[in-house]
């Protein structure tokens, strides 16, 4: 089969091969496509409500006035020539539609170094295939799930019109020290091939370096971290930052189900007691900061103290959360 | 039901004392942490001291060292001794309950019971 495609809402004239130019003729067309069930036979008497969507011309060539998404399908012409010699045409047609110049909404004047920030969302109305979204930065292409950047897609189709809108969420987590501004831009690549990309007009956030905060300092009481079964343990957590960030709890890596508060206290410590503790101090403007980690243990009688529990870990600073 | 009743609110000058008492009654005293929360004006309820099992104890790092918690298990009291007071210890102090934890934080939205409150005030 021949491939064709037609853009929406244009005509279209597929010729019958072999088909005298003029009646008397001996042919037939054949579609199945989105408006038939099964297979529809035209033929050149026409009449009747298929001439407004596919009537046979005098030539023996069919013309489609406005080719439609429901005109996709297998086109098929059977003629015989004067002398009987039968020839069979057969097309297969696509059709698409080409949408507006896509356009970048809800775009960020400033993206935060070291944290994930939204780009902005490129949006794309009236397109058919669905066709796809892509982005760049700096011109090149950015790759979802690579060096902190995340994409979340959507496609809707309109219901009357069968048309696609395409939605391109753009996460991005900047390098610290990176471009101060990036280009970012999106285009449309048509469903359909020899169809050009669509860009968007580039936007240039600004990129915002925190200043590294002071750290969070996690004190325990007893010092060292290691207290005889049924004593206590306070956890205090220390944020020079005004006004007061929120502060959580983890154990072992695992957010504890207690509210805000700098201080933890382990009243009564049992085996159940015994891991790993960080605080997670939450700034308004920063975004989340992890203390050190501080390995609370139980000495039984007669060992020593500080050596049973050691007071360290990986001080993983303002993007632990990030 | 579980009843907190404080007393022993008052007004006094600058480096004076108070006793504050809170009686408890429908808890099982000994197994609960027992705690004075303090509100001032527009400011946040903030926990001040907490007891709990033996002489377990907790204090608000301002207060170390001027207020004293204690409890008597068989009366089913506790008690806030208050010393060296300054006006920026002016405020309603609450006595407040909690069923014996696992972990205890200073949030106000970890204790179950709470008292009435008394006024402490101090003058400069």
């Known amino acids: 089969a021949q491939n064709i495609t037609a853009r929406i809402g244009e005509p279209l004239v597929l010729k019958c091969k072999g088909a005298p130019k003029k009646p008397p003729q001996r042919l037939e067309w054949k579609l199945n496509t989105g408006r038939t069930e099964a297979w529809k036979v035209l033929s050149p008497q026409g009449g009747g409500p298929w001439d407004s969507v596919a009537r046979v011309l005098p030539n023996g060539s069919l013309f489609l006035p406005a080719v439609g998404i429901q005109d996709e399908g297998i086109f098929r012409c059977q003629a015989m020539n004067r002398n009987g010699k039968e020839t069979k045409s057969n097309y297969r047609v696509r059709v698409y539609q080409i949408p507006g110049k896509p356009e970048i909404v809800d775009s960020a004047s400033e993206l935060t170094a070291g944290v994930p920030n939204k780009v902005g969302t490129c949006v794309s109305e009236g397109s058919y295939p669905a066709g796809t979204l892509s982005w760049h930065l700096d011109g090149k292409p950015l790759v979802p799930n690579e060096k902190g950047v995340s994409v979340k897609e959507q496609t809707r189709r309109h219901p009357e019109t069968g048309l696609f809108t395409l939605q391109s969420e753009l996460m991005v987590t900047p390098a610290r020290g990176g471009d101060p501004r990036p280009t970012f831009s999106c285009s449309f690549s048509p469903g359909l091939p020899r169809h050009r990309a669509l860009r968007t007009a580039p936007i240039q956030p600004r990129v915002w370096e925190p200043v590294p905060l002071e750290e969070v300092q996690l004190v325990v009481e007893p010092e060292g971290g290691a207290v005889a079964p049924g004593g206590t343990v306070t956890l205090t957590c220390e944020v020079p930052a005004q006004p007061s960030p929120q502060i959580h709890w983890m154990k072992d890596g695992v957010p504890l189900p207690l509210p805000p508060s700098p201080v933890l206290i382990l009243p009564e410590i049992g085996p159940q007691d015994q891991g790993t503790y960080s605080c997670v101090a939450t700034h308004s403007s920063h975004g989340p900061q992890e203390s050190r980690a501080v390995s609370i243990s139980i000495i039984e009688p007669g060992e020593e103290g500080p050596t049973a529990g050691s007071v360290g870990g990986s001080g993983l600073g303002t993007l632990a959360l990030a | 039901a579980v009843q907190l009743v404080e007393s022993g609110g008052g007004s006094v000058e600058a480096g004076g004392s108070l006793r504050l008492s809170c009686a408890a009654a429908g808890i099982a005293f000994s197994s609960y942490i027992l705690a004075w929360f303090r509100q001032a004006p527009g400011k946040e309820r903030e926990l001040v001291s907490a007891?709990?099992?033996?002489?377990?104890?907790y204090y608000l790092p301002s207060v170390k060292g001027r207020f004293t918690i204690s409890r008597d298990n068989a009366k089913n009291m506790v008690y806030l001794q208050m010393n060296d007071l300054k006006p920026e210890d002016t405020a309603v102090y609450i006595c407040a309950a909690k069923e014996f934890p696992r972990w205890l934080t200073l949030s106000p939205l970890d204790y179950d019971h709470w008292g009435q409150g008394t006024q402490v005030t101090v003058s400069s």
């Open positions: 007891s709990w099992r033996g002489d377990s104890t």
